[in-house]
């Protein structure tokens, strides 16, 4: 009642290995690492057979089949390439995930290399079975920002792609008679979020209540250069409008807000996010130079009073930009305290501009980002938001522009963007 001698399968083994197998003896067939037992189209780790009374084995020896991890999953904003010839997906084959450069970058700077494991899963040394994440690259325009800027008063035309984070925010309140329409700027933080000033998105009421405009009345344009030609721009409606809860209409303290876009915008050469600063209380240091862009008033001969009285919303057709130095808090406070009127330069604000005037941001530039190049990270960072200025015409001597100090609000911004009320996919590479 002996059973015939067994031949182990290729890439496999039989245990126990005996010279003779008798009735009721059992053997376990297993495969080498990276191979699985294949029996009747079923895949298993081991297979047991038994020597029967009649001297035959209960089953034929199965074969060992190489583990196949299958086609790798697609990566949002990324692609996968095969490192192994013939696009093999079997055990020990390698693939590499990469992100759509230069607009996306891999989180944690992982290699993106995955190997087909013995368990049949694509595995990375660091991320294990999780896929990498492609985050938008922030603060790195595809076109290098220029070093020298001549005298949005005293500014110059921006070339397309210089400020890929720049957003035009148009608010049209059709519920009012006559229709109320105004605009401001904003800065793209991720595919779904726009950073701006709260006063741009506050419903223009006659009393001092702070109520956000209805999201239905907000349109955001990205990748826009000339407001007369919106054909190349991406326009998006708002899913949510969030004003800072402490925004004070009296003194413009906490003048910061977010717009969540209805759907994520595709990133490209003309649409890229700006970086947020590190959360630190000091903000940008005096004399640091920043750039700010906008479609606001660029005619130095027109006073703000004239514009308000005439009721027109004069704006530049082509995006303008200007380079301005940060002014010390003490100097700015002093310059406003010497004026009639109840001006308050709080610790949530900083100032920028020239003592002699000539260059400034102006009406219509509100909400735009004051960006500074961070030498350490080699990214442009939104340190400020165009907020307010004195009563004199823009660019007047010793009237500095006042900006919201963004570094004081990084915790609030992240909390809002990651709150359960918000859509996911919000991280940005720093």
């Amino acid at each position: 009642n002996e059973c015939p001698k067994l031949q182990p399968p290729v890439y496999g083994k039989i245990e126990p290995s005996q010279a003779v197998y008798s009735f009721k003896d059992q053997v376990l067939v297993s495969c080498d690492t990276g191979y699985k037992v294949l029996k009747d189209n079923g895949v298993m780790d081991t297979f047991q057979i038994e020597c029967l009374k009649d001297g035959a084995w209960s089953n034929k020896i199965p074969t060992c089949k190489i583990v196949d991890c299958g086609a790798p999953a697609g990566l949002k904003h990324g692609l996968v390439t095969f490192s192994t010839r013939n696009n093999l997906t079997t055990y020990k084959s390698e693939i590499r995930y990469s992100c759509q450069q230069p607009y996306y970058k891999m989180l944690h700077n992982t290699t993106g290399v995955y190997t087909c494991s013995a368990h049949g899963t694509w595995t990375n040394e660091v991320l294990k079975r999780s896929l990498p994440t492609c985050l938008p690259v922030c603060g790195q325009p595809s076109r290098a920002l220029p070093n020298l800027v001549k005298r949005i008063i005293g500014g110059r035309n921006a070339e397309l792609g210089l400020f890929p984070w720049q957003a035009l925010i148009v608010v049209e309140d059709t519920s009012r008679v006559p229709n109320d329409k105004w605009f401001g700027s904003g800065a793209l933080l991720s595919e779904s979020w726009i950073l701006t000033a709260a006063h741009v998105l506050r419903s223009q009421r006659r009393d001092n209540t702070v109520i956000p405009v209805s999201k239905e009345h907000v349109t955001v344009y990205l990748g826009l250069h000339d407001v007369r030609d919106k054909s190349g721009a991406v326009n998006s409606s708002a899913a949510r409008v969030i004003l800072h809860p402490d925004f004070n209409i009296q003194n413009y303290n906490h003048d910061i807000a977010l717009v969540q876009l209805q759907k994520p915008v595709p990133l490209g050469a003309h649409v890229m996010p700006i970086c947020l600063p590190r959360p630190e209380p000091e903000g940008p240091a005096p004399h640091m130079l920043g750039l700010v862009a906008g479609w606001g008033i660029s005619n130095p001969n027109v006073t703000v009073d004239e514009i308000i009285l005439s009721g027109t919303r004069t704006l530049s057709d082509v995006l303008q930009y200007v380079k301005l130095p940060v002014v010390s808090h003490a100097e700015c406070k002093a310059s406003y305290e010497s004026r009639s009127g109840n001006y308050s330069v709080t610790e949530n604000m900083f100032c920028a501009g020239y003592y002699e005037g000539g260059k400034d941001t102006c009406l219509g530039d509100s909400g735009g980002a004051f960006v500074i190049f961070d030498e350490m990270s080699q990214h442009w960072v939104a340190q400020g938001l165009v907020s307010w200025g004195g009563p004199e015409e823009c660019g007047s001597k010793q009237v500095y522009g006042v900006y919201t100090k963004v570094s004081n609000y990084v915790d609030w911004l992240w909390e809002e963007m990651n709150s359960p009320r918000a859509v996911r996919d919000l991280q940005v590479e720093r």
Partner: antibody, heavy 120, light 107 residues
Framework: QVQLKQSGAELVKPGASVKMSCKAS????????IEWMKQNHGKSLEWIGN????????KYNEKFKGKATLTVEKSSSTVYLELSRLPSADSAIYYC?????????????WGQGTLVTVSS | DIVMTQSQKFMSTSVGDRVNVTCKAS??????VAWYQQKPGQSPKALIY???YRYSGVPDRFTGSGSGTDFTLTISNVHSEDLAEYFC?????????FGSGTKLEIK
């Protein structure tokens, strides 16, 4: 999670000084200022001042200038409040607290308080 | 300094009632008011910030309203565990100041 652990109760003689501590954990210490409040028995709260570990900047309520001194030991994420020339009116519970948002000084996280008793 | 006045030192209420705790600022503080609850022998706990925003984990029976100088904390359906003292605080300008407190007593 954010935690503020304060030092134990103190019994001090009138005219003496006392130094109490507030040890922070569960967040990046240098991101938020530590605030200090005084609460007399059965009374309301008074804001003494705050200390920002990021740059060592401190702000004081005019009423407590010369009375309170705030210092830091960054290595242990601890802020200290020293009160000098104590009269019996300074017998109170002293709380340290942390803001929820850096720019908005309302206090989401509080220490358990340090009871200071000034008595001869 | 901005004075925060809580005119009612004590308020008596029954379980299930609705109660309004008021606070008045001596000058306009915009929306920058917070409300705290303090139970005997405990540290204060934040309930409301920015006049009307409920802090995380606070039951929705607590609501805040007001702006400028007049502020109200409403407890819509008083529970026995709401027996505590309630303080308002302005954080519009230095020095930050608190109201004198309102003690809620359950009948």
């Amino acid at each position: 999670q954010v935690q503020l652990k304060q030092s134990g109760a103190e019994l001090v003689k009138p005219g003496a000084s006392v130094k109490m501590s507030c040890k922070a954990s569960g967040y990046t210490f240098t991101t938020y200022p530590i605030e200090w409040m005084k609460q007399n028995h059965g009374k309301s709260l008074e804001w003494i001042g705050n200390f920002h570990p990021y740059n060592g900047d401190s702000k004081y309520n005019e009423k407590f200038k010369g009375k309170a001194t705030l210092t830091v030991e960054k290595s242990s994420s601890t802020v200290y409040l020293e009160l000098s020339r104590l009269p019996s009116a300074d017998s109170a519970i002293y709380y340290c607290a942390r803001r929820h948002y850096a720019a908005s000084p309302w206090f989401a996280h509080w220490g358990q308080g340090t009871l200071v008793t000034v008595s001869s | 300094d901005i004075v925060m006045t809580q005119s009612q030192k004590f308020m008596s209420t029954s379980v299930g009632d609705r109660v309004n705790v008021t606070c008045k600022a001596s000058q306009n503080v915009g929306p920058t008011v917070a409300w705290y609850q303090q139970k005997p022998g405990q540290s204060p706990k934040a309930l409301i910030y920015s006049a009307s925003y409920r802090y995380s984990g606070v039951p929705d029976r607590f609501t805040g309203s007001g702006s400028g100088t007049d502020f109200t904390l409403t407890i819509s359906n008083v529970h026995s565990e709401d027996l505590a003292e309630y303080f308002c605080q302005q954080y519009n300008s230095y020095p930050f100041t608190f109201g004198s407190g309102t003690k809620l007593e359950i009948k």
